[in-house]
């Protein structure tokens, strides 16, 4: 085994990013760091095998099979896949390394299989054995982080019940407001299930896997905060576990808080209180209320007051089933072929719900944002002022919404014409929809004034291009206009647009636009 | 059903007084607070005071000094007494309890 080549054989998983999809250059995508697949000789085999590590890839994921082959002079190679024999172009790194590599774009369940690469060097020839399979997501789970309180500890921990395990990190943020976005430097991240520090604004813990992320916001009522206008409000459903926070700073300790359901107080154990001496010597107490499994019997106001701040109180409502509630009428948009438009839709949810906006069988990705008064708002602004249906589709565990968008781009029509032996046509886009006009021109009317009337067959908004109307008229040849020159002209509220035919020649017919 | 009644605004001159009063129906006041609220014309709605179960008063810092609430338990009414009123206190005033808010009542300060 002394001449056998060094090998390495490494995974290279790809990030799609939009503008390379669909491209099959060898490098098509931004990737991850490479993952080696160890590349070991197989034992009791005939000639000189070499088997990677098995590789599970995501249905949709793009991935490289590379081997880096450290032996002197050339290499030749061919790739084989289900017995069907593939182009194989390797060439040489900076440390003059071969290297071989096998594209796959958007891994599909025809791709999964045995990758089988053969190389010749001037020493010796071998195979390299790639077994790729799908991951089987069918079993996969991510479900949204709860919070349990820690066994004789201040403190509390994050579940996720997910599979493959989740990480769980917690998200914090002492700033009020828009600095507190994922982002920001205001942020701090905690990778660790159990929470000690619990005074902060802003508490989230989020879970996420090979399915993505799932977050749950501490709900927080903060006593110094001015009382707002709309009753927060928290759904759950039965079963779930119910944690409020209540939050109120003072310049000495002489104050406390108390939680009341409906105006009863808690029952010992449905709370627990901390408090903390601020930076600057102010008192900070926080007041949990929770409830391990919620039942109906749970909903209601809860009220948290303090002998130094105005109370204020929280709209629990606990329901069997998840929900998503908005108007799904449809909706008709005209603008301007500048204008500035947003498509939105507004909410109430829960669990929180996951969206896309699709136009043009083209997905595009979906923002929500909370409101004050308990909705949650997702817009769409990136149209590019291309007319046509566009779809906001909306998904929870328990509930699904569609709503669909028609926009109209307002401008003058432009026309095209075609012509046959027996009629002459012509179709415009603009919006809105044209009407159309038909005139001769000929000695008595060079300036093609006489209007044909006869033999016209008008077809409005005949066929729909991704949701975008096309007009249509058609002029049925008759003895009187053959050899002619005929005008059809379409005319909106933008203004007109005209194309001229010849009604006698054979073959392609010359047209002659002016607008 | 719960319904809230607001009453007591009108026109008063830069310095003069005005009781608002709220009277509720189909909910006990003395177990819950209350709070009042105004909205100015082009603004949004605004906190003003509140009067919690036990009689504490809060105040927002611009109308402290100026106006006191009070409750009176046996008629399930609440009172927000207004001095030295300001152009600036011009509003719709309101009363709430949790949810529940009144149709509201018209105080304009001009002279």
């Known amino acids: 085994n002394q001449d056998l080549p060094v090998i390495k054989c490494v995974l290279i998983n790809h990030k799609n990013n939009d503008s390379s999809v669909g491209k099959s250059s060898s490098y098509p995508m931004v990737s991850e760091s490479p993952e080696d697949l160890g590349c070991a000789l197989r034992p009791q085999s005939s000639g000189t095998v070499y088997e990677a590590a098995a590789v599970e890839v995501d249905v949709s994921a793009s991935i490289t099979l590379q081997v880096l082959v450290d032996a002197p002079g050339n290499i030749s190679c061919l790739w084989v896949f289900k017995h069907s024999s593939l182009n194989c172009q390797p060439h040489f790194d900076l440390q003059n390394r071969g290297v071989v590599s096998m594209v796959i774009l958007k891994m599909t369940e025809t791709q999964a299989g045995e990758y089988l690469l053969f190389i010749q060097s001037e020493a010796t020839n071998y195979t390299i054995l790639f077994t790729v399979s799908i991951r089987n997501t069918l079993l996969y789970t991510l479900r949204r982080p709860y919070f349990r309180k820690m066994e004789n500890q201040d403190a509390l921990v994050c579940i996720s019940e997910s599979v493959p395990e989740p990480i769980v990190e917690w998200v914090l943020c002492d700033s009020q407001g828009e600095s507190c976005k994922e982002e920001s430097p205001a942020v701090v991240k905690k990778e660790e299930k159990v929470l000690h520090e619990l005074f902060g604004t802003d508490i989230r813990c989020c879970a996420r896997n090979e399915l993505g992320r799932e977050c749950t916001r501490l709900f927080t009522i903060d006593l110094n905060q001015t009382p707002q206008t709309t009753l927060p409000q928290l759904f759950l459903k039965v079963g779930e576990p119910l944690w409020i926070r209540c939050k109120a700073v003072h310049v000495n300790h002489g104050f406390g808080l108390t939680w009341e359901l409906e105006n009863k107080a808690l029952e010992e154990g449905n709370y627990f209180e901390m408090s903390t001496y601020s930076t600057n010597r102010t008192m900070i107490r926080i007041l949990f209320a929770f409830v391990s499994s919620v039942a109906r019997n749970d909903t209601g106001y809860y009220t948290c007051s303090s002998s130094k701040h105005p109370s204020q109180s929280a709209l629990v409502t606990i329901v069997e089933k998840g929900f998503i509630n908005a108007t799904n009428s449809s909706e008709d948009y005209e603008i301007d072929q500048y204008e500035e438009f947003c498509f939105s839709v507004r909410f109430k949810a829960y669990p929180q719900i996951r969206c896309t906006w699709t136009f043009s069988r083209k997905s595009f990705p979906c923002e929500q944002k909370g409101l004050d008064n308990g909705y949650s708002i997702s817009k769409f602004c990136n149209h590019k002022h291309q007319p046509g249906e566009y779809i906001f589709h909306a998904e929870n565990d328990d509930a699904q919404f569609t709503k669909m968008f028609t926009l109209n781009i307002r401008r003058k029509p432009q026309v095209l014409a075609e012509a046959s032996a027996s009629q002459a046509s012509c179709f415009s886009d603009g919006y809105p929809l044209p009407s159309w006009t038909w005139k001769k021109c000929s000695d008595k009317s060079p300036n093609c004034t006489e209007e044909i009337t006869e033999g016209v067959w008008n077809r409005k908004a005949n066929r729909k291009v991704f949701g975008q109307w096309v007009s249509s008229s058609t002029l049925n040849m008759s003895e009187a206009i053959k050899g002619f020159l005929v005008k059809c002209c379409a005319y909106n509220s933008l203004g007109t647009s005209c194309e001229t035919i010849l009604l006698n020649s054979p073959g392609p017919f010359p047209f002659i636009q002016d607008n | 059903q719960v319904q809230l009644q607001e009453s007591g605004g009108g026109l008063v001159q830069p310095g003069g007084s005005l009781r608002l009063s709220c009277a509720a129906s189909?909910?006990?006041?003395?177990?819950?607070?209350i709070d009042w609220y105004r909205q100015a014309p082009g603004k949004q709605r605004e906190w003003v005071a509140q009067?919690?179960?036990?009689?504490?008063?809060f105040y927002a810092d611009s109308v402290k000094g100026r106006f006191a609430i009070s409750r009176e338990n046996a008629k399930n009414t609440v009172y927000l007494q207004m001095n030295s009123l300001k152009p600036e206190d011009t509003a719709v005033y309101y009363c709430?309890?949790?949810?529940?808010w009144g149709q509201g009542t018209q105080v304009t300060v001009s002279s």
């Open positions: 189909g909910v006990t006041f003395s177990i819950n607070y």
């Open positions: 709430r309890v949790l949810s529940y």
């Open positions: 009067i919690t179960r036990d009689s504490n008063s």
